[in-house]
């Protein structure tokens, strides 16, 4: 068994998945609390199956071919909090099978063949918080009379056959407050008026319902924080009309998702009943534009318009959403043009995500981002080339995070496009094809903490003594992986005294570059996948003063020429990450052997 179950945390957490086991191995300690036991073979479970493991708090029995759960199966498991029975073809659950775990909070009965809620022995589940019943054959949500709904927070019925919901059905859930109720994929065809007006919901999900009129009519007088009415590509559903959305006037909703639907008509009054709405997700709703002067969206704080068909940013008619703080337009189907001042009316905007849009701009981004003076997060990653002038982001002086990853940048040297960003903390420049010889590139970033330069190459593969990093003395995290580096000057990082995380992986560095880290202490240092073979004794103190080091995937020498390092390695195993992949390359007889297993005797 020692070769089989994996110990994740001594005496506490074990993974015994997919081992063909038909009982609990004797060598599993009694103190086990967290057990992953899925994909084994337990056709019948009873009061002796797990009786030894009285400390269990989490038990995953997914797809163990369980048919029968007998009386008092979990009688001694008072601490059991999560029980996962997903994917077991249950024929019988004894009335007392769940009597022991008084603190059971999360019960998963997904894909267990249940067709009637009477099947579940519920009377002891006073503390149940979430019940997952997806992918079964349930047609009525009528629970037994004694169903304890008081603490219930999540009730998931997705992908069942619930076509009608009555007031009577919902009465058993009246005690639940802030319940998240999921009917996704049920093709609900009718809701009795008033069924949902007896309690306040955290979220209601009717995703994939072909006829939304049924939902809007049935939810009159209801209150929910979030209403998910999205659909899916393969569902043939009715277009949303303005008239249909009038149903929202009779309910209280803060967050609404309509993804993948089509609108038959969008006019200035389409969203007039959305006056209380704070979040609206219109992902993939085939929109080409939104009309100006739309009523009802004054309080909207978050808007998602991803995967649509806009030609230009002005077509979203941003003036409709004066209170907006978060705007996401990702993966537009067409090449998206930023236009001039298209978002200028969004003076409260804090987060703007324009990634994956094929955006191209020769003079970015002052005119395009005009008046976004409160913007804190800007994502322009995965776009086409952007030309950045000096102070390209001067309209966004409050920026704290700027993500330009995988967007080729054309920078007007020798100035810095970032020089007015006095609050910028995170800058992602992964694979931006930067001219790293421009020493002013990062000037004017006094509080930059996290800099990702992955995939940007340095001239001659060298970071010299004078380099673009000297202006960012506040850096704590520096990522220089895959930068084609061959060497780093001993003084290259001398102005970076605050660093706690340095990633130099996937380069071609030799041990000489370790000298550049001599002034740093207690850092996480990733040197994986470089060209390090022998590490001389004089460099070992530099490694010793760091907290975690990764030297995996280097062509390490395991001969007596490297004995000082090999000895140091074994003494410092607690500091080393990736030791399974830290192997010898030389001599040929030891190639592939883990460093920790090497035993050398050197005269």
């Amino acid at each position: 068994w020692d070769q089989m179950c994996i110990e994740k945390e001594a005496n506490k957490t074990y993974n015994c998945e997919n081992l063909g086991l038909s009982e609990i191995p004797d060598t599993l300690p009694n103190t086990t609390e967290f057990l992953e036991f899925s994909f084994n073979f337990l056709p019948t479970i009873h009061n002796r199956t797990f009786s030894r493991l009285m400390n269990l708090t989490f038990l995953d029995l997914t797809r163990c071919q369980i048919n029968w759960i007998h009386e008092d199966t979990f009688q001694s498991h008072h601490q059991l909090s999560t029980l996962v029975l997903t994917g077991n073809p249950l024929i019988f659950m004894a009335e007392t099978s769940l009597n022991g775990p008084k603190s059971l909070k999360h019960l998963f009965l997904i894909q267990t063949g249940i067709s009637n809620l009477e099947f579940i022995p519920v009377h002891n589940l006073e503390n149940l918080e979430s019940l997952y019943l997806g992918s079964n054959h349930i047609s009525s949500i009528k629970f037994p009379k004694d169903f304890p709904a008081r603490n219930l927070k999540v009730l998931d019925f997705q992908n069942n056959a619930i076509h009608y919901i009555s007031r009577e059905d919902m009465r058993s859930l009246e005690q639940a407050i802030n319940l998240s109720l999921n009917f996704n994929g049920n093709n609900v065809k009718g809701i009795e008026l008033g069924a949902f007006d007896s309690t306040i919901f955290q979220s209601l999900n009717f995703g994939g319902t072909p006829n939304l009129s049924v939902i809007f009519n049935g939810l009159q007088n209801s209150t929910t924080q979030s209403l998910w009415l999205g659909t899916f590509e393969d569902i043939d559903d009715e277009d949303i009309s303005s008239a249909m959305l009038k149903g929202l006037c009779e309910m209280s909703v803060e967050s609404l998702n309509l993804q993948e639907h089509r609108f038959s008509d969008i006019s200035s009054t389409t969203f007039q009943c959305f006056t209380q709405l704070q979040e609206l997700d219109l992902t993939a709703t085939h929109l080409k534009g939104l009309p100006s002067g739309m009523k009802g969206l004054n309080l909207l704080k978050k808007l998602v318009l991803s995967v649509n068909h806009f030609d230009q940013l002005c077509q979203i008619s941003a003036a409709n959403f004066p209170s907006l703080t978060h705007l996401y337009i990702r993966g537009n189907v067409k090449k998206l043009h930023l236009g001039v001042g298209c978002l200028e009316k969004l003076g409260n905007l804090q987060t703007l995500d324009l990634s994956h849009n094929d955006i191209e701009a020769s003079d970015c981004c002052s005119l395009q981002l005009k008046n976004l003076s409160h913007l804190q997060t800007l994502n322009l990653s995965h776009n086409e080339p952007l030309g950045l002038q000096s102070q390209a982001f001067k309209e966004c002086p409050q920026l704290e995070l700027l993500d330009l990853a995988f967007t080729r940048l054309h920078i007007n040297a020798p100035q810095s496009p970032f020089q007015n960003l006095h609050f910028l903390q995170v800058l992602n420049l992964t694979y931006c094809f930067l001219d790293t010889s421009n020493q002013h590139l990062l000037a004017g970033l006094p509080v930059l903490r996290h800099l990702n330069l992955k995939g940007n190459h340095f001239q001659d593969g060298t970071i010299t003594k004078t380099n673009l990093l000297q202006t960012v003395g506040s850096l704590e995290v520096l990522i220089l992986s895959s930068c084609g580096l061959l060497s780093i000057d001993q003084q290259a990082f001398h102005s970076l005294g605050k660093m706690s995380h340095v990633d130099l992986s996937h380069n071609s560095l030799t041990c000489d570059s370790i000298d550049s880290l001599s002034h740093l202490k207690g850092i996480y240092l990733n040197l994986a996948a470089n060209s390090i073979n022998i590490i001389s004794p004089r460099l070992l103190p530099i490694l010793s003063q760091q907290s975690t080091i990764n030297l995996s995937h280097n062509p390490l020498d395991c001969t007596c020429s490297n004995i000082h390092f090999l000895t140091w390695y074994k003494e410092n195993l607690h500091k080393l990450e990736g030791s399974e992949e830290t192997t010898c390359a030389n001599p040929p007889s030891l190639r592939g052997v883990k460093l920790s297993d090497v035993k050398l005797s050197c005269g």
Partner: antibody, heavy 118, light 107 residues
């Protein structure tokens, strides 16, 4: 067919102001920014500034910041440039020109000749 | 401001000849360059954008090269309708500026 039709030639006295118009047709007027370009006699072209007809946002060449004022009338798909405090230096042909992504000019008006003379 | 310098300022050539006009930017402008042709008494017309792409309807005898600071426009087998003045223009930052123009005349 995209067309930019400019107003006719003007003769004005020094110190006066005048307004040139540019009527757009054949495309969505609010979907493209409108630029103005000056060509002095026998000289090169100079970019004056631009306006986004959708929202009225403008950007000027610093050199013309106090000389030109750009406006639009969406209802008639017309862009205007008003030139202030005219001197003989302002005598030139003025063009309106459309661009889509704040870059190059794909369609030009026929030009308006302005002569400033007492 | 970025200065654009064109050369030559003027040249004479015969129908059927090949000519080359060059444009130099005072700073690196990558491929953010357009070329225009202007005939006497007419407005300019877009010939080339993004330094390399011929505008719609421009004949293939026009070819372009260059990026960074040095660009050229070459016209093979000159036709009578090719005579006029040619301008380059950058769109890398504001203000967008034009070259001084190259006047191409019939010899």
């Amino acid at each position: 067919e995209v067309q930019l039709q400019q107003s006719g030639p003007e003769l004005v006295k020094p110190g006066a102001s005048m307004k040139i118009s540019c009527k757009a047709s054949g495309y969505s007027f609010t979907g493209y920014t409108m630029n103005w370009v000056k060509q002095s006699h026998g000289k090169t072209l100079e970019w004056i500034g631009l306006i986004n007809p959708y929202n009225g946002v403008t950007s000027y060449n610093q050199k013309f910041k106090d000389k030109a004022t750009l406006t639009v009338d969406k209802s008639s798909s017309t862009a205007y440039m008003e030139l202030l405090s005219l001197t003989s230096e302002d005598s030139a042909i003025y063009y309106c020109a459309r661009d889509y992504n704040y870059d190059y000019f794909d369609y030009w008006g026929q030009g308006t000749t302005l002569t400033v003379s007492s | 401001d970025i200065q654009m310098t064109q050369s030559p300022a003027s040249l004479s050539a015969s129908v059927g000849e090949t000519v080359t006009i060059t444009c130099r930017a005072s700073e690196k402008i990558y491929s953010y360059l357009a070329w225009y042709q202007q005939k006497q008494g007419k407005s300019p017309q877009l010939l080339v954008y993004n330094a390399k792409t011929l505008a719609e309807g421009v004949p293939s005898r026009f070819s372009v090269s260059g990026s960074g600071t040095q660009f050229s426009l070459r016209i093979n087998s000159l036709q009578p309708e090719d005579f006029g003045t040619y301008y380059c223009q950058h769109h890398f930052g504001s203000p967008r500026t034009f070259g001084g123009g190259t006047k191409l005349e019939i010899k």
